[in-house]
């Protein structure tokens, strides 16, 4: 038999259970926590990476200023309700019975309420911006270089499609993505920007998704780009409802 | 996901030299973890050696250091494996293998997803 056949794992999600009992001995990997088949050839949808997560052991500027409707992710973990599709359900509840809307990347975006509370439809984030702070280096990076490297990154590791990151901005040390994506945009089997800038956020911080003991290693022209600072904010298609209290706060 | 083929097995006296090839398909090859494996007859695989994206960082099983070379021409995507002072003990099937895009890897099967089908290496007298 050949290594490939050895080697049963799923090389885009660690936190999956595989075996060969697919069609004519294929490898077949079902996700920790949900038991939902996986495509190892994509990214697992962050829904069902959060849901893995929970049931594993616990262990003149060119920046862009955020708009004023986007989210920070300032909930952190929790174990969520995913579709059969593996999407964030538009409702999600704790086991106290408090409940809240998400975005499309799970990211709350109205006051908590009770069971009561009614959630029309998963709304959309089509813009997500992710601003780094690099290490010090000797020098700046090339900022062209630093862009094409960048977009090389989500093209093949994230297996994102180039036209949904928008633009690379820099500023040393700083360092801004920005992924968007409409509804309209997003073609069967194209990866969703939420999707990839969550494995982007667990490289970062030293947690890789993908297969093996290894991590991300980025380079700019062979210069390690190494990252002290993350921050990430989602933008949704329609703007979130919050209360004035929560502004005020 | 890169096609990967190896060549450049056969027989060989003990002390002799081969050099083996592993011609990979797709654009991500050059920024990837490069590695070569074996299995020995009726053993489990074995990692041989593995090379960063850059050629600037390589890793050696003990039982090869000093006799192996590994590099790569990422203008070619090939990579190769320089066996000198061959012993029967390396009789093996070896294979080319390679790490997800911008993954770091090691000497473990784990790390790597992509894999040919193998060049059967022979050492005897």
């Known amino acids: 038999h050949t290594a490939a056949q050895d080697n049963c794992t799923c090389p885009t999600n660690k936190m999956t259970v595989c075996s060969p009992d697919g069609p004519g001995g294929r490898c077949q990997c079902r996700a920790l926590g949900s038991g939902m088949a996986v495509d190892c050839s994509t990214l697992t949808s962050k829904c069902l990476l959060l849901k893995a997560r929970m049931s594993a052991p616990k262990n003149a500027r060119t920046l862009v200023r955020p708009s004023e409707h986007a989210l920070v992710d300032n909930d952190g973990l929790y174990d969520p309700d995913c579709d059969p599709e593996g999407r964030f359900k538009a409702r999600q509840c704790n086991q106290t019975s408090v409940c809240w809307c998400v975005n499309s990347v799970g990211v709350r975006r109205t006051d908590k309420g009770d069971l009561s509370l009614r959630c029309d439809e998963l709304v959309r984030t089509h813009h997500i911006l992710i601003d780094l702070r690099h290490r010090p280096t000797a020098g700046a990076f090339n900022h062209s270089d630093l862009d094409a490297e960048l977009r090389r990154l989500f093209r093949e590791r994230y297996r994102l499609h180039p036209k949904f990151v928008a633009a690379v901005h820099y500023e040393q040390p700083t360092i801004q993505i920005e992924l968007r994506q409409n509804t309209s945009q997003k073609a069967a089997g194209d990866v969703d920007i939420g999707d990839a800038a969550y494995y982007f956020e667990r490289d970062i911080k030293g947690e890789s998704l993908f297969q093996g003991r290894g991590g991300l290693d980025l380079r700019v022209r062979g210069e390690p780009l190494q990252v002290e600072r993350t921050l990430i904010y989602y933008l949704d298609e329609i703007p979130p409802k919050f209360s004035m209290k929560r502004l005020t706060a | 996901q890169v096609q990967l083929q190896e060549s450049g097995g056969g027989l060989v006296q003990p002390g002799g030299s081969l050099r083996l090839s592993c011609a990979a398909s797709?654009?991500?090859?050059?920024?990837?973890?490069m590695g070569w494996f074996r299995r020995a007859p009726g053993k489990g695989l074995e990692g041989v050696s593995v090379?960063?994206?850059?050629?600037?960082?390589?890793y050696y099983a003990d039982s090869v250091k000093g006799r192996f070379i590994i590099s790569r021409d990422n203008s070619k995507n090939t990579l190769y494996l320089q066996m000198n002072s061959l012993r029967p003990e390396d009789t093996a099937m070896y294979y080319c293998?390679?790490?997800?895009?911008?993954?770091?890897?090691?000497?473990?099967?784990?790390?790597?997803?992509?894999w040919g089908q193998g060049t059967l290496v022979t050492v005897s007298s």
């Open positions: 293998a390679a790490s997800w895009p911008y993954q770091t890897a090691s000497l473990d099967a784990m790390d790597f997803t992509d």
């Open positions: 797709g654009s991500t090859y050059s920024r990837r973890y």
């Open positions: 090379i960063s994206p850059y050629g600037d960082s390589t």
